[in-house]
């Protein structure tokens, strides 16, 4: 059978078709039904409501929807013993303990098992000591500190503001740093924007409000106690102490009403600048310890938190493929909450609800798609990726072997401004095309396309006329399958105006006021921007399971190749008499780029002349743009870091949200004028060039004619 | 044939300016970034300072921020040092350097020497 025959529509109206069966209304109605109460990942609660999407996506005419459990690494408080922070006077009696739980907003006030604010994984352990303010705790902030300031952390508490990178990273600075607690909290002048009132008035982050995460450094690895293996029946289990990415000093995260308290006391060095200033009114003074009055005061940490082996529930869903149905194309997103959820995940498995629905509709209308496409609802992304990871790390083997590509779908907004995307550079053609076709939300763009308004708002840095596409970091459900499998991956959702705070999230993130009623009050209350992600999410996995010919563009990577050997060059450029010296050479990997172009400018001329109509002939094409993000992976993994395998990107060693890119290279010249052993440092670059160069070259020899 | 040629060394007194110029031939500036990079007598190369894409970014060693500025002319291909309130210890020798757009090897000028003293 022709494609056409065997999906029973014709191409053009089946997009169509899909596109106009998503509603704003049902959007609406999933997330108010997913948000009314917790979904904490390890929970009956989120055990129910995972079997309440299988059977609706069974309804909705999946041809299968299964539940795929583990028994992961969780965290938890302790009940009856909750975490605090206090400051001790000279005779050791608490003069101020931190809250215990955030104030609960209207409506929810008898809802249980809210769980309080927490840091996911912190170990127990009661330090005391003098405080020392850190800024952002970033690798750059405890230079400045250590190596300008000559201020010591070691056997210190650190205060650190939220915001700016991940905050596992902040944890394992600080522990780099020998201090023996972390103090986490959310500063006005990252959490709280000018002119808009806190929540329930306004979407703001009021001073008890808290933002809760996990503080692991997982670097990929799944459950803590199964690196590389499924948490199942079977699975052997490390010992806790040999288990990966734990904390091993007490944090906990608090509100900036009580952050004020600590900080109002604090003397030792002034900042050094204004970039160590927040919004509150204290000095931001870096301490170690209190000023004159209170330098006899000190901060002890209460922590209690426990580890526990407990079962988690993934929901996998199969629309088989017609015509090829051993290719998988995936759109998954998380169901865990830390809460309610309103934001963080729900808004995006609303989204994916209604994608759901949508494909069942045309499939009970005699469509299949061209290729398999599953639907996945993650649990324990809150809890370090795990419900993706451990089910890529089951399948594996049929994963590497047919997975075409995957779309990520957590929160659709994180504001309601503009589009964000961060995707291969495979997908750059796909989502530039797929955006041209869709109509723009934004008010002041009627009648005009979701490319244009993006553009407009969110320019290319590098090419006039078109949008801002990044690079995929971490932190995120697409993780395994990007930066460990190498299958083709993308994002998209609602932003913000705000590029300077990039990676500091909304206001309200991981806080007990991340409800429904935030989402429909003051972020999207007609859901437009909800309905249009649905459009590009879905729109996306359409044409990735149904287009003939895989919509993949090789030569977009060649260019951004190019781009990111420049960009690595240049770093290297500041040393230019020890590339003298050790002989360090950046022509193989301009070679191998350089080769890479003239390949994939020949594969994509060789792609527009062949015969679609030759099954066998068309299947070799698809199956070379398929293994091209394949061909990037390093079965050895970076230095360190054995589950980030992608030679191209890899989440940051500083920031596991941001996308770095040739991350061996990177890594290997970061602060090399400080290592030791000058000649080791340039030997290990030299090898990165090495590692770098061969793998474009033996990438480029992927989309060669085969014979 | 790919080429990069330094212009505007010369003696100058401390505290004065001069300015460097750089014109590449037989290549156009669309790469990533341009370099300035110095040697002095009898040290080794030392980068001075980076010029990215359409010249809206760039960064300089520490000892020279605030005292000079790069820029680029992408119509006229070339690449310009402007370096204000000298000092001795900026007596080098100047070079550029950079890369076509589509070139394996990195282009270095042949440089220019710049003499600070009184």
């Known amino acids: 059978k022709s494609s056409n025959e065997a999906t029973n529509i014709t191409p053009k109206h089946n997009m169509k078709a899909f596109l106009d069966e998503l509603k704003a209304e049902n959007i609406k109605k999933f997330l108010y039904n997913f948000t009314q109460i917790p979904h904490l990942a390890g929970t009956e609660q989120n055990f129910q409501l995972a079997k309440q999407i299988q059977s609706q996506w069974k309804e909705f005419g999946l041809d299968s929807v299964e539940l795929a459990h583990y028994d992961v690494l969780l965290s938890y408080p302790n009940k009856t013993h909750p975490n605090y922070i206090s400051i001790i006077n000279e005779d050791g009696n608490e003069i101020f303990n931190t809250s215990l739980f955030e104030p609960p907003p209207p409506g929810y006030e008898n809802v249980s098992d809210i769980v309080p604010p927490f840091s996911a994984f912190s170990p127990q352990g009661m330090p005391e000591g003098d405080l020392v303010y850190v800024n952002y705790a970033r690798t750059e902030d405890f230079f400045k500190l250590e190596r300008d300031m000559k201020i010591n952390c070691s056997g210190k508490i650190v205060i650190a503001r939220y915001g700016k990178v991940f905050r596992g990273n902040k944890v394992k600075n600080a522990q780099l740093a020998g201090a023996k607690g972390v103090i986490l909290y959310s500063d006005p002048a990252d959490y709280f924007a000018p002119g808009v009132k806190s929540y329930p008035d306004g979407w703001n982050l009021p001073g008890g409000g808290v933002q809760r995460g996990n503080i692991l450094n997982l670097n990929g690895a799944g459950d803590p106690l199964t690196p590389g293996y499924p948490a199942n029946e079977y699975a052997y289990r490390r010992g806790i102490a040999e288990a990966v990415g734990l904390p091993s000093i007490p944090v906990h995260p608090i509100g900036y009403y009580d952050a004020q308290k600590l900080l109002e006391k604090m003397g030792g060095s002034a900042p050094p600048d204004s970039s160590w200033r927040g919004s509150l009114k204290v000095p931001y003074n870096v301490g170690p310890g209190f000023t004159g009055n209170f330098s006899t005061q000190k901060v002890k940490m209460h922590i209690h938190s426990t580890n526990e082996v407990t079962r988690i529930y993934n929901v996998i869903g199969t629309l088989r493929g017609a015509v090829e149905p051993d290719r998988y194309v995936i759109l998954g997103g998380h169901r865990d909450s830390w809460v309610f959820g309103g934001i963080d995940p729900q808004s995006g498995a609303a989204v994916v609800h209604e994608i759901v629905r949508s494909f069942g509709t045309l499939k009970k209308e005699g469509w299949r798609p061209r290729r398999t496409i599953l639907f996945a609802s993650w649990d324990a992304e809150e809890f370090g990726l795990l419900g993706s990871t451990e089910w890529a790390e089951e399948n594996s083997r049929l994963l590497q072997e047919r997975g075409v590509a995957y779309i990520n779908a957590d929160s659709s907004i994180e504001g309601n401004y503009t589009l964000r995307v961060d995707c291969t550079p495979l997908m750059y053609s796909l989502v530039h095309n797929l955006t041209k076709e869709l109509k723009s939300p934004d008010e002041g763009f009627e009648g005009k396309s979701l490319y244009e308004s993006w553009t407009k708002k969110s320019p290319s840095p590098e090419f006039s006329g078109m949008p801002r596409i990044s690079k995929l970091g971490s932190g995120n459900d697409f993780e395994v399958f990007f930066q460990r499998l190498g299958i083709a991956s993308g994002r998209a959702r609602y932003t913000k105006n705000w590029e300077t705070n990039k990676f500091s999230g909304y206001p309200l993130y991981h806080s007990v006021y991340e409800t429904y009623e935030l989402v429909e009050k003051f972020y999207d209350p007609m859901f437009k921007y909800h309905l249009t992600v649905a459009q590009v999410r879905g729109g996306m996995v359409f044409e990735l399971a149904n287009s003939i010919v895989l919509p993949f563009d090789c030569r977009d990577y060649a260019v951004v190749l190019r781009k990111y050997a420049d960009k690595i060059y240049s770093i290297s450029m500041k040393h230019p008499q020890e590339m003298k010296t050790y002989s360090v050479s950046f022509d193989s990997l301009f070679s191998a780029v350089k080769n890479f172009t003239e390949i994939a400018s020949k594969f994509s001329e060789r792609l527009q002349d062949f015969d679609k109509s030759n099954p066998i002939v068309l299947r070799m094409m698809n199956d070379q743009l398929m293994f091209l993000e394949r061909a990037f992976i390093d079965p050895l993994g970076l230095p360190d870091r054995p589950f980030y395998r992608h030679v191209i990107y890899a989440p940051s060693s500083h920031n596991k949200y941001a996308g770095e890119s040739f991350p061996g290279i990177y890594d290997a010249l970061f602060d090399i004028e400080s290592k030791v052993d000058p000649s080791k440092a340039w030997g290990e670059v030299k090898r990165q060039i090495y590692v770098a160069a061969f793998t474009v070259q033996a990438a480029a020899e992927t989309l060669s004619e085969v014979a | 044939e790919v080429q990069m040629v330094e212009s505007g060394g010369g003696v100058v007194q401390p505290g004065r300016s001069l300015r460097l110029s750089c014109a590449a031939s037989?290549?156009?500036?669309?790469?990533?970034?341009m370099h300035w990079v110095r040697q002095a007598p009898g040290k080794g190369l030392e980068w001075v300072a980076t010029?990215?894409?359409?010249?809206?970014?760039?960064e300089y060693v520490d000892s020279v921020k605030g005292r000079f500025t790069v820029s680029i002319d992408n119509a006229k291909n070339t690449l310009y040092l402007q370096m204000d309130s000298l000092r001795a210890e900026d007596t080098a020798t100047y070079y550029c350097v950079g890369r076509d757009s589509t070139s394996i090897t990195p282009v270095w000028g042949l440089g220019t020497l710049v003499t600070v003293s009184s």
């Open positions: 010029i990215y894409q359409d010249g809206s970014e760039s």
């Open positions: 037989g290549f156009t500036f669309s790469s990533y970034a």
